[in-house]
């Protein structure tokens, strides 16, 4: 039977999505106990039937990976959680409409920072996602977001930064002082979806200039 207030057993049912890995999470309510079990269903926009997620039925953990089930980039999804307490009380709550394109956040890019004597090179590695193309290969963020670009910044001192940006993967900051430490930050930007990743940061030191020794 339904509790007087579903929030007594179940709260904050939501998708947490990063780089298209879509995890359903929730919290127990004030009357939830460690032996409360949770069952997860999902569906697409406008469909009547909820589909039970295998591996997430009568579980006690408070998360469920729905990445595979929510992998269509143009689809809208919902998920819902039914909590059943040891005493047989139950509560069901559903997520808001979920679009992975709209709602996923971007992790910092994977970058290799290479020190040289008077320059620092930064190589951005393509970011894989769980999304698969028709032929089965995994798409990168660059495949999904056609307007994706990288924004790179090199902190030279407290008052001066150098900036580079573009769609290419390799960048180099020139004209630097040898044997000096710099802080580099690299972000992914997707203007059409107003997305900006957290920065990847590398602290690098230019090589000493050996030509005078």
């Amino acid at each position: 039977h339904a509790p007087e207030d579903p929030s007594d057993l179940l709260q904050h049912v939501k998708f947490q999505s990063s780089n298209f890995e879509n995890i359903l999470t929730w919290d127990s309510g004030p009357e939830g106990t460690p032996d409360t079990v949770y069952s997860i269903e999902y569906k697409t926009y406008g469909e009547r039937d909820w589909v039970a997620k295998k591996g997430c039925q009568r579980i006690t953990r408070k998360s469920c990976n729905l990445t595979v089930e929510t992998g269509n980039l143009t689809e809208l999804y919902y998920a819902r959680v039914t909590a059943v307490s040891a005493g047989g009380r139950s509560a069901t709550k559903m997520t808001d409409r979920f679009s992975s394109l709209q709602h996923t956040t971007l992790k910092p890019p994977d970058v290799t920072c290479i020190s040289k004597v008077r320059s620092i090179q930064m190589i951005v590695h393509p970011t894989p996602t769980p999304i698969r193309a028709g032929d089965g290969h995994r798409l990168t963020l660059e495949d999904i977001f056609h307007d994706l670009f990288y924004h790179l910044e090199l902190q030279v001192n407290r008052t001066y930064q150098m900036h580079l940006g573009g769609k290419q993967r390799e960048y180099e900051f020139f004209g630097l002082t040898p044997d000096t430490e710099f802080l580099g930050t690299i972000m992914i930007c997707v203007p059409t979806w107003a997305k900006e990743s957290a920065p990847y940061m590398c602290r690098v030191k230019t090589l000493p200039d050996r030509t005078w020794t």
């Epitope: 339904a2 579903p6 049912v13 939501k14 697409t44 926009y45 406008g46 009547r48 269509n72 143009t74 689809e75 809208l76 919902y78 819902r80 509560a91 069901t92 709550k93 559903m94 997520t95 808001d96 409409r97």
Partner: antibody, heavy 116, light 113 residues
Framework: EVQLVESGGGLVQPGGSLRLSCAAS????????MNWVRQAPGKGLEWIGE????????TYNQKFEARATLTVDQSKNTAYLQMNSLRAEDTAVYYC?????????WGQGTLVTVSS | DIVMTQSPDSLAVSLGERATINCKSS????????????LAWYQQKPGQPPKLLIY???SRESGVPDRFSGSGSGTDFTLTISSLQAEDVAVYYC?????????FGQGTKVEIK
């Protein structure tokens, strides 16, 4: 059996407010979206907005955004429509209707008459 | 907003004859994710709330007689009552759920000739 029962209609003065209730039974309100639709006498159907009762997230028809507020009380399994600054043209039967796209269950409606 | 326009506004059909109602949307209702159209049809009898007949343009709601069928794609849709019965006298509405705000056609009144 799913049932939606609206209440709270009646005669309201122009410039006044109304608060309509939609009591759900036969299912948990938090298991689906709830919509409000109105129908002026002898006229067509007009969507006011929707609420996700689990989260309280709302989407309104821009026409009503400034005057309508959708809320729920999960413990009462009841959804509410509050409308302010009422005028004669708000005279209508107000329905609550379930689901997120089209509407599979409707209440019987409650008549609101705005008149002095 | 998507404008839904129904035609005719009313029609009179003999018992047992076919009734056809058209609904035109101001933009395509084709939902790319499932290649279905975001269109529903409702029946409303006097003093009653609307009743869902058809969703996704052509899927019949459970319990709805099979004389009711929906067809069409993109911007042009049709509700057909293959053999009109006395209990089918009502106003019929189409509704789009492709984008906010959800909008309805102005309604078509079906009567017996």
């Amino acid at each position: 059996e799913v049932q939606l029962v609206e209440s709270g209609g009646g005669l309201v003065q122009p410039g006044g407010s109304l608060r309509l209730s939609c009591a759900a039974s036969g299912y948990s309100l938090t298991a689906d979206y709830m919509n409000w639709v109105r129908q002026a006498p002898g006229k067509g159907l007009e969507w006011i907005g929707e609420i996700n009762p689990s989260t309280g997230t709302t989407t309104y028809n821009q026409k009503f955004e400034a005057r309508a507020t959708l809320t729920v009380d999960q413990s009462k399994n009841t959804a509410y429509l509050q409308m302010n600054s009422l005028r004669a043209e708000d005279t209508a039967v107000y329905y609550c209707a379930r689901f997120d796209a089209y509407f599979d269950y409707w209440g019987q409606g409650t008549l609101v008459t705005v008149s002095s | 907003d998507i404008v839904m326009t129904q035609s005719p506004d009313s029609l009179a059909v003999s018992l047992g004859e076919r009734a056809t109602i058209n609904c035109k949307s101001s933009q395509s209702l084709l939902y790319s994710s499932n290649q279905k159209n975001c269109l529903a049809w409702y029946q409303q009898k006097p003093g009653q709330p609307p009743k869902l007949l058809i969703y996704w343009a052509s899927s019949r709601e459970s319990g709805v007689p099979d004389r009711f069928s929906g067809s069409g794609s993109g911007t042009d849709f049709t509700l057909t009552i293959s053999s009109l019965q006395a209990e089918d006298v009502a106003v019929y509405y189409c509704q789009q759920y492709f984008s906010y705000p959800f909008t309805f056609g102005q309604g078509t009144k079906v009567e017996i000739k």
